[in-house]
Each structure stands twice: as structure tokens, then as C-alpha cells.
């Protein structure tokens, strides 16, 4: 009987990330007796919900239940039945729903009501659905990556547990790119902030952190593309838009009503003499880059330094983890390696965008054309945002680490969100040592 395995004393948590383009469900697991230790929570499952983001269900809310079924059933399978009732479920909606709420608070509420009704039908401990703020999204992303990198641990290790981990306790900045917003979060050199709205103060594991964060609504990759199209069609002489951000030979018809559906294009809205226009790709990185830069207003700054649109940005400091769409896009383009310089990335983007559409389709036959067609824009947008928007340079580019997962857990806001809501990040350092050395072996 001595050799009989004891039942695992573990806990689970579920977070649904209801993004603008899709919803993902994450299942986390941790040893029950080590709740307050740093780095013990890890992701055991990610389930991507089939279909668009929840904001797209505004005219078909009755379909939300079916939409969520597969991933919720998957959670039922992964988590032992005996633990269903004590497993918390959180749904956080991000910029897609922020935009819907700007259009109609009532419609946004209706979507969340139906989401809540659907999730309440499962045997888990459902804790509600809410639209998280851009500030939360940035802060929780920062907490996630630093928790996973072991930056909150008081032990200084002589070796690294992840490839890009530096052995000091300096935290990583967080760069998050979604479909509808983008967040930048880091600990600046100077703790005093010129802009209190962008300042957060945390006490985690006995240490104080003064964090800068900002979320740029409408500057996620999908909404930035809509903005660019709305801006460029203003000066088109007819219903043909020759677009440098799409491959030569690429053609796509866009409805003007779709273009002006989002609040993000309101500033460019005008009465056009046509209901549709056709994008015709010309595949020119430099021109695409120039067109994107017009989305960033850098002429006005009421602070010592700004990112764009008059938003304060302190001088960049330390290493940064760039995740979500920053990672997915750069991974597709094969540009995530630490060895690839900014100049090399630019060169690769010039070549990629100039490739004919037919050639691209052949080379990436397995990729959906809708996504495939937008990598030239997305890659160029990432470069423009990081270099001109956030003021990274060729030198500081080397401090950007494109991260998908850290020790098996996805980089993103969901883990930090759950750690906070389950009170698993103590303000003070726990008395017991966080992890024994043997854990690392």
C-alpha cells in the first residue's frame, strides 16, 4: 500500500479570452498546497472556439450557446468531475466588446447576458463575464509573462529556465497585439509618471512595482487595417484602391458599409460615390509603411515624450516580451529568432510583400486566404508600430523577444487575470520557500 499513488491535490481554473476576432478557453492547474508560490500555475489546455469574436453575435445572440459548447465540453473532459463545482470560470472580453459598447451599450450588455446564461449551465463555478479595461489587459499581460519567467521569485538562479531569461530580477515589459487594440506595459527607469492615467502601482511578493501601461483602442491589427482602408479610400479617384499593403495581383471587393461599421473609422468617414470598392494589391513595403504612419498622429504631445495621438510614453527600458498577434504574425513570417536584426526583418518584409499573390497562395496552400492575404499588412504594421509608434530602434529591437508560450503556458492576459481573481499573487513574500531546488531538476 505504501507505493500506492496518492490522489493529486490540485486545483483548476478556466479563463475565456473573448477577443475581437475569436474566443479562446484556457485551463490552468496548480498544486493546492502551493497556491501562493510563484510560477506554480501552468496551462494544461487551450481550446480555440470555432467562429468569430462574441461581438459578432450581436444580431444572432441565440447562437452563442452552441458557439461555446465544444470548448466548454472539452473543459468538462479535462478537469476531473469531482473538481467541477470548485473550478472557477471567468470570461473577459477585450477591445472588440469595448468597441461594441461604444456603439451600443445595450447590445453589448445583451451579448454578455447571453454569454453568462450559457456559461451558467455548466457544472463549474461561473464567476461572470465582463469587459476588461485596456489598462487591465496590459497589466495582466505583464503579470503573466513575469510570473512565468520567474521574475517575482526572490531566488536568483545561476541558470536559466527559459531561453531568453536573464538571471537578474528585472521584469520584462509586455507588448500585446490583438485584433482591435494593442497594449504596452513596462517598468520605466523613472518611477514618477507625468500621466497618472498610465501609472499602476503593484506590490507583489514583497516588492513594489511602478508600472506604465497604455492600451491603444483601434490599433489592433484588424482595426488598424480598417482605419488604413478608410483613410486611403478618401483620396481614391474611383472605386479602385491600389494598395501597397497587399501582394501584387491580389484583388478583393470591400463594402463601404462594412468599412464604416466600426467606430475606429469614424474619423475618416465620408460620403463616397460608390457602395463598394476593389482593393488591388501592388505589394510595396515602403509605401505600405508610409501609409500606416499616417494613422499615428505624432505632431501633438503634451508630455516630455509621447507614443502617438498625444499619449505619454516614457523612455523604453529593459527587455520586452511581444506576444499574441506580435508573435503569431512574426512566427508565420519566420522572424521570431533572436538573431534576426531589425534591418533583416525590414528586408524580409520588403521581399515578402513584393511576392505575387499567386506565388504566395502556392507557397502557403494550407493557409486560409483571408489570413494569408493580410500578413504583408500585419508584418509592416508591427514594424511601424514598434519603431515609429513605440520608438524602438535598431539597437533596442534586440531587446524584443517574440514569445508564444513560456514553459507551456501562453503569453497573454488570461493567466494574470486568473491569478489576481483567485488571490494567488500575494502582496508579501510567502514565508515558505517558493520552490525547492529539486523542482527545477
Amino acid at each position: 500500500t505504501q507505493n500506492k499513488a496518492l490522489p493529486e491535490n490540485v486545483k483548476y481554473g478556466i479563463v475565456l479570452d473573448a477577443g475581437s476576432s475569436h474566443t479562446s478557453l484556457y485551463i490552468y492547474k496548480w498544486p493546492a498546497e502551493k497556491e501562493n508560490d510563484t510560477g506554480v500555475v501552468h496551462q494544461v489546455e487551450e481550446c480555440r472556439v470555432k467562429g468569430p469574436g462574441i461581438s459578432k453575435f450581436v444580431q444572432k445572440v441565440n447562437e452563442i450557446g452552441i458557439y461555446l459548447t465544444d470548448c466548454m465540453e472539452r473543459a468538462r473532459e479535462v478537469i476531473p468531475r469531482s473538481q467541477h463545482q470548485e473550478t472557477p470560470v471567468y470570461l473577459g472580453a477585450t477591445a472588440g466588446m469595448r468597441l461594441l459598447r461604444m456603439e451600443s451599450e445595450e447590445l453589448a450588455d445583451r451579448v454578455l447576458d447571453v454569454v453568462e446564461r450559457s456559461l451558467s449551465n455548466y457544472p463549474f463555478d461561473f464567476q461572470g463575464a465582463r469587459i476588461i479595461t485596456g489598462q487591465e489587459e496590459g497589466a495582466y499581460g505583464w503579470i503573466t509573462i513575469n510570473y512565468l519567467l520567474g521574475k517575482f521569485s526572490q531566488k536568483t538562479r545561476w541558470f536559466s529556465i527559459v531561453p531568453y531569461e536573464t538571471n537578474n530580477q528585472e521584469t520584462f515589459g509586455a507588448l500585446d497585439l490583438g485584433g482591435a487594440s494593442t497594449q504596452v506595459t513596462f517598468v520605466p527607469q523613472n518611477a514618477t509618471s507625468e500621466s497618472p492615467a498610465n501609472a499602476l502601482a503593484f506590490r507583489l511578493y514583497g516588492k513594489d512595482y511602478n508600472v506604465y501601461t497604455h492600451s491603444f483602442l483601434c490599433y489592433g491589427k484588424d482595426q488598424a487595417l480598417w482605419q488604413k482602408l478608410a483613410k486611403d479610400i478618401q483620396v481614391a479617384s474611383n472605386e479602385i484602391l491600389r494598395d501597397p499593403c497587399f501582394h501584387p495581383g491580389y484583388k478583393k471587393v470591400v463594402n463601404v458599409s462594412d468599412l464604416y461599421k466600426t467606430p475606429c473609422t469614424k474619423r475618416f468617414e465620408m460620403t463616397l460615390p460608390f457602395q463598394q470598392f476593389e482593393i488591388q494589391g501592388i505589394g510595396n513595403y515602403q509605401q505600405c509603411h508610409q501609409s500606416i504612419l499616417e494613422l499615428f498622429n505624432t505632431s501633438y504631445c503634451p508630455y516630455s515624450q509621447c507614443a502617438f495621438n498625444g499619449i505619454f510614453l516614457p523612455p523604453l527600458q529593459g527587455d520586452f516580451g511581444a506576444f499574441s498577434a506580435f508573435y503569431f504574425v512574426m512566427k508565420f513570417l519566420n522572424l521570431t529568432s533572436e538573431k534576426v536584426s531589425q534591418e533583416k526583418v525590414t528586408e524580409m518584409m520588403k521581399k515578402f510583400c513584393a511576392q505575387p499573390w499567386e506565388e504566395i497562395k502556392t507557397s502557403y496552400a494550407g493557409v486560409k486566404e483571408k489570413y494569408l492575404s493580410e500578413y504583408c499588412f500585419s508584418g509592416t504594421y508591427i514594424l511601424s508600430l514598434l519603431l515609429q509608434g513605440y520608438h524602438f530602434t535598431a539597437d533596442s529591437w534586440e531587446h524584443i523577444h517574440f514569445i508564444g508560450k513560456i514553459q507551456g503556458s501562453d503569453a497573454g492576459w488570461t493567466l494574470g487575470y486568473m491569478l489576481n481573481l483567485t488571490n494567488m499573487i500575494p502582496a508579501e513574500q510567502p514565508l515558505s520557500t517558493p520552490l525547492s531546488h529539486s523542482t527545477y531538476v
Epitope: 459598447r101 451599450e105 450588455d109 454578455l112 447576458d113 453568462e116 446564461r117 451558467s120 461561473f126 464567476q127 461572470g128 463575464a129 465582463r130 469587459i131 479595461t133
Partner: antibody, heavy 121, light 107 residues
Framework: QVQLVQSGAEVKKPGASVKVSCKAS????????MHWVRQAPGQGLEWMGR????????WYAQKFQGRVTMTRDTSTSTVYMELSSLRSEDTAVYYC??????????????WGQGTLVTVSS | EIVLTQSPGTLSLSPGERATLSCRAS???????LAWYQQKPGQAPRLLIY???NRHTGIPDRFSGSGSGTDFTLTISRLEPEDFAVYYC????????FGGGTKVEIK
């Protein structure tokens, strides 16, 4: 569908306290704030305060501070409004009204049927 | 606190006529923070308009809201028999306040 069902009419003596309940159903109770508004006979509407059922935090109108207490019981999806040191001018119909989700705007989307509180010696 | 003054106090009109109700704030109110309610005798108020001009679910399109800053208007384009009631405006700026109400009665 969303329903807010309030407790029955009360008759109280001056100086006493009254506790009115409002039971919510048809939605996730913790997701929306709950407000209390009163209306004296033949008069207009007067906002008393609100409670966030998720965390129990409250915000009271200046006029009622120190006399009003709003609480909630998440297990029964019920909010309570207690008014102490009653006087004759507190005679009114008291309404609970569902407010906003976090991050929304403060308008009152759904109202209870009202509870008449009469203060008389 | 912001004071809302509604005028007129009473509006006597016939069915089919247009009703224009005014709500003036003692200081500027963000449009997204102004709402209108209807109350019939013995009933709880009912939300009509939020965000100054957005109709609540199920509210007929004869009701419309407009205005910004300190001056807001509720318009009922063609009065139906069921529209005769008291109408309140409401603002939110740290605390909620209501206007004194306008009674729309049958002439």
C-alpha cells in the same frame, strides 16, 4: 426575463428603521449594479444610492449618508436597503432599479414594482 | 450636485400632436450620461432614452432624444393615448439626479 421583486408595504413609527428587499432573477446577479430611488406621494424621483453586488461596495447620495445601508446576499440574489431614524417625510414608494455593468453608463434599465413605506405615529 | 430643470411643468396636448419636453442642466453634462423615463400613475418608471438620443429596447420610434451640454430635449412626434404620463430626465455625474418631471396631459 429580468425581474426585480420587492418586499411588501411597511408601516413604521418615527425613529424606527425599515429594511426593504429586492430579489433579482433572469440574469447574473453579480454583473449589474443595483440602485435605490424613492418617490414621495405626488413628488418626483429621488436617488438614494447604489450597490455593486459583486463586491458589496456602496455609494450613497449625500442626503442619506449615515442613515441608509445597502447590502446584498449573493446566495439568494437579493439586495436590501435599510433606512434608519425614520421621519414622516420618509413616507414614499421605494424602488430598486437595475443599473449598469461595470464600465457602462448610469441609467436605470429595469425597475422593481415599488414598496410603499409609511411613517406615521 | 447638478440640478436638472424640466419645462414646462405640464403640457396639455391632443393625441396626434407633437410634444417637445425640455431638460436644462445647471452645468454641462456628457451626452452619454443623460436619460429619459416615462412614469404612469401607480407604475414604476420606464427607461425610454439613454445616452441622450438612444432608444431603449422596445421603445417606439416616435420617441426621440437630442441635445448636448446643458440643453436636452425629448420629442414625441405624434402622441398616442398611452403616451400621456409624467416624463423625467436623469443625469449622472458622480451622483444621479432627476429633473422635477413634465406631465403630458390630454387637452
Amino acid at each position: 426575463q429580468v425581474q426585480l421583486v420587492q418586499s411588501g408595504a411597511e408601516v413604521k413609527k418615527p425613529g424606527a428603521s425599515v429594511k426593504v428587499s429586492c430579489k433579482a432573477s433572469g440574469y447574473t446577479f453579480k454583473s449589474y449594479e443595483m440602485h435605490w430611488v424613492r418617490q414621495a406621494p405626488g413628488q418626483g424621483l429621488e436617488w438614494m444610492g447604489r450597490i455593486n453586488p459583486s463586491v458589496g461596495s456602496t455609494w450613497y447620495a449625500q442626503k442619506f449618508q449615515g442613515r441608509v445601508t445597502m447590502t446584498r446576499d449573493t446566495s439568494t440574489s437579493t439586495v436590501y436597503m435599510e433606512l434608519s431614524s425614520l421621519r414622516s417625510e420618509d413616507t414614499a414608494v421605494y424602488y430598486c432599479a437595475r443599473g449598469k455593468r461595470e464600465g457602462g453608463t448610469e441609467y436605470l434599465r429595469k425597475w422593481g414594482q415599488g414598496t410603499l413605506v409609511t411613517v406615521s405615529s | 450636485e447638478i440640478v436638472l430643470t424640466q419645462s414646462p411643468g405640464t403640457l396639455s396636448l391632443s393625441p396626434g400632436e407633437r410634444a417637445t419636453l425640455s431638460c436644462r442642466a445647471s452645468q454641462s453634462v456628457a451626452s452619454s450620461y443623460l436619460a429619459w423615463y416615462q412614469q404612469k400613475p401607480g407604475q414604476a418608471p420606464r427607461l425610454l432614452i439613454y445616452g441622450a438620443s438612444n432608444r431603449h429596447t422596445g421603445i417606439p420610434d416616435r420617441f426621440s432624444g437630442s441635445g448636448s451640454g446643458t440643453d436636452f430635449t425629448l420629442t414625441i412626434s405624434r402622441l398616442e393615448p398611452e403616451d400621456f404620463a409624467v416624463y423625467y430626465c436623469q443625469q449622472y455625474h458622480n451622483a444621479i439626479t432627476f429633473g422635477g418631471g413634465t406631465k403630458v396631459e390630454i387637452k
